[in-house]
């Protein structure tokens, strides 16, 4: 004969444990039903009656099968630098994540405790490492032959336009100005997708005859160091 299915509450066999979604009540010394997510134990079980569950109140939740006497309070409303990516329901806590342009400077178990604005790279510097949900932008000086004239948390150093005749040489924060109506080539192919700028900015304002006519090939490399260069944009 097959073993009979026990209905809660029931006394477990010595040495055995309660089944899935059941818990052992120390007082009643019985296996009793857990409450489903979104509910809590309103009345604990006895030897003769099973757990009585009730729905969580507004702004409270339980995420797991449980026998807690009260539901957990949802976290406070998301701050102005955050967006609510998961609403507070009876079955889940509110989750706040940083809004676009911000990153999580201090995380918690789920979501973010403290958001901070992503660093913006000033002119002469480009984004070398983009910001993520949990890390800030890293800025690096633009390499020779490249520039950035923006203050931005996304802009990388871009190649100077290549001129037939240079009117004003480019530097780290300014594109080259050509005398002819149009440059021979507006940028080196593929260079815009550089994951991080090579960071020497030396020689950008050196009074050389045509510094932009033969661009450095160093910024065409996918990444990595260029040799230290002697030069100056200094005073």
């Amino acid at each position: 004969l097959p073993a009979q299915v026990a209905f809660t509450p029931y006394a477990p066999e010595p040495g055995s444990t309660c089944r899935l979604r059941e818990y052992y009540d120390q007082t009643a010394q019985m296996c009793c039903s857990k409450c489903s997510p979104g509910q809590h134990a309103k009345v604990f079980c006895t030897k003769t009656s099973d757990t009585v569950c009730d729905s969580c109140e507004d702004s409270t939740y339980t995420q797991l099968w449980n026998w807690v006497p009260e539901c957990l309070s949802c976290g406070s409303r998301c701050s102005s630098d955050q967006v609510e990516t998961q609403a507070c329901t009876r079955e889940q806590n509110r989750i706040c994540t940083c809004r676009p342009g911000w990153y999580c400077a201090l995380s918690k178990q789920e979501g973010c405790r403290l958001c901070a604005p992503l660093r913006k790279c000033r002119p002469g510097f480009g984004v070398a490492r983009p910001g993520t949900e949990t890390s800030d932008v890293v800025c690096k000086p633009c390499a020779p032959g490249t520039f950035s004239n923006t203050t931005s948390s996304t802009d990388i150093c871009r190649p100077h336009q290549i001129c037939n005749v240079v009117a004003i040489p480019g530097n780290a924060s300014m594109d080259a100005v050509c005398t002819s109506t149009s440059p021979t080539r507006s940028m080196a192919p593929g260079a815009v997708h550089l994951p991080q700028p090579v960071s020497t900015r030396s020689q950008h304002t050196q009074p050389t005859p045509e510094p932009s006519t033969a661009p450095s090939t160093s910024f065409l490399l996918p990444m990595g160091p260029s040799p230290p260069a002697e030069g100056s944009t200094g005073d």
Partner: antibody, heavy 119, light 106 residues
């Protein structure tokens, strides 16, 4: 907390070289460039140049480019500034300062290193 | 190279006074101007960056403003700890400090 700790005072003869160190702590050393600034006794601040510790790339002020060498050792989070062919007018306090390339410039400084050039 | 002309070079004032220090750029530097405070024997301390932005922890009596290529540092009500030397610093094209303003007790 962020700290830049510089090496101690130096006395040098004219024509000699001096190497000043700047040890960084409390932040990711390679995420910031290090500037060097000097100040002669009773005078103003003078920008000398910067180094990007990530690659060792540099940018020097015209005035110093023939005599200064800036280096960095990322394994010990330390930047170095070496000034050669010292003259008496190089007597100054030399400072390092960090810069993350954002508008927030030079937000942390070393305590300064006095270099005295005297025969 | 961009030159920064700072004035006055020295200034006497009393506690509670409103003080202004100006810096003029030889050409446009956008808003890339910072102000530093330096006390004797100490390293400079960043007060204001990007012309207007107050560095964390700096009292709100310090403020920065701009009119064209003229930049101003204002201390609304001088406190005893404010007597020091102040430097402007442009970081738009290269890097250049102003000559400094020594603020002394009258």
């Amino acid at each position: 907390q962020v700290q830049l700790v510089q090496s101690g005072a130096e006395v040098k003869k004219p024509g000699a070289s001096v190497k000043v160190s700047c040890k960084a702590s409390g932040y990711t050393f390679t995420d910031y460039i290090i500037h060097w600034v000097r100040q002669a006794p009773g005078q103003g601040l003078e920008w000398m140049g910067w180094i990007d510790p990530d690659y060792g790339n540099t940018d020097y002020a015209d005035k110093f480019k023939k005599r200064v060498t800036m280096t960095a050792d990322t394994s010990i989070s330390t930047a170095f500034m070496e000034l050669s062919r010292l003259r008496s007018d190089d007597t100054a306090v030399y400072y390092c300062a960090r810069d993350d390339g954002s508008p927030l410039v030079m937000d942390a400084w070393g305590q300064g290193t006095l270099v005295t050039v005297s025969s | 190279d961009i030159q920064m002309t700072q004035s006055p070079s020295s200034l006497s004032a009393s506690v509670g006074d409103r003080v202004t220090i100006t810096c003029q750029g030889s050409q446009n530097i956008d808003n890339y101007l910072a102000w530093f405070q330096q006390k004797p024997g100490k390293a400079p301390k960043l007060l204001i960056y990007s012309t207007y932005s107050l560095q964390t922890g700096v009292p709100s009596r310090f403020s920065g403003s701009r009119s064209g290529t003229d930049f101003t540092l204002t201390i609304s009500s001088l406190q005893p700890e404010d007597f020091a030397t102040y430097f402007c610093f442009q970081y738009n094209q290269g890097y250049m400090f102003g000559g400094g303003t020594k603020l002394e007790l009258k």
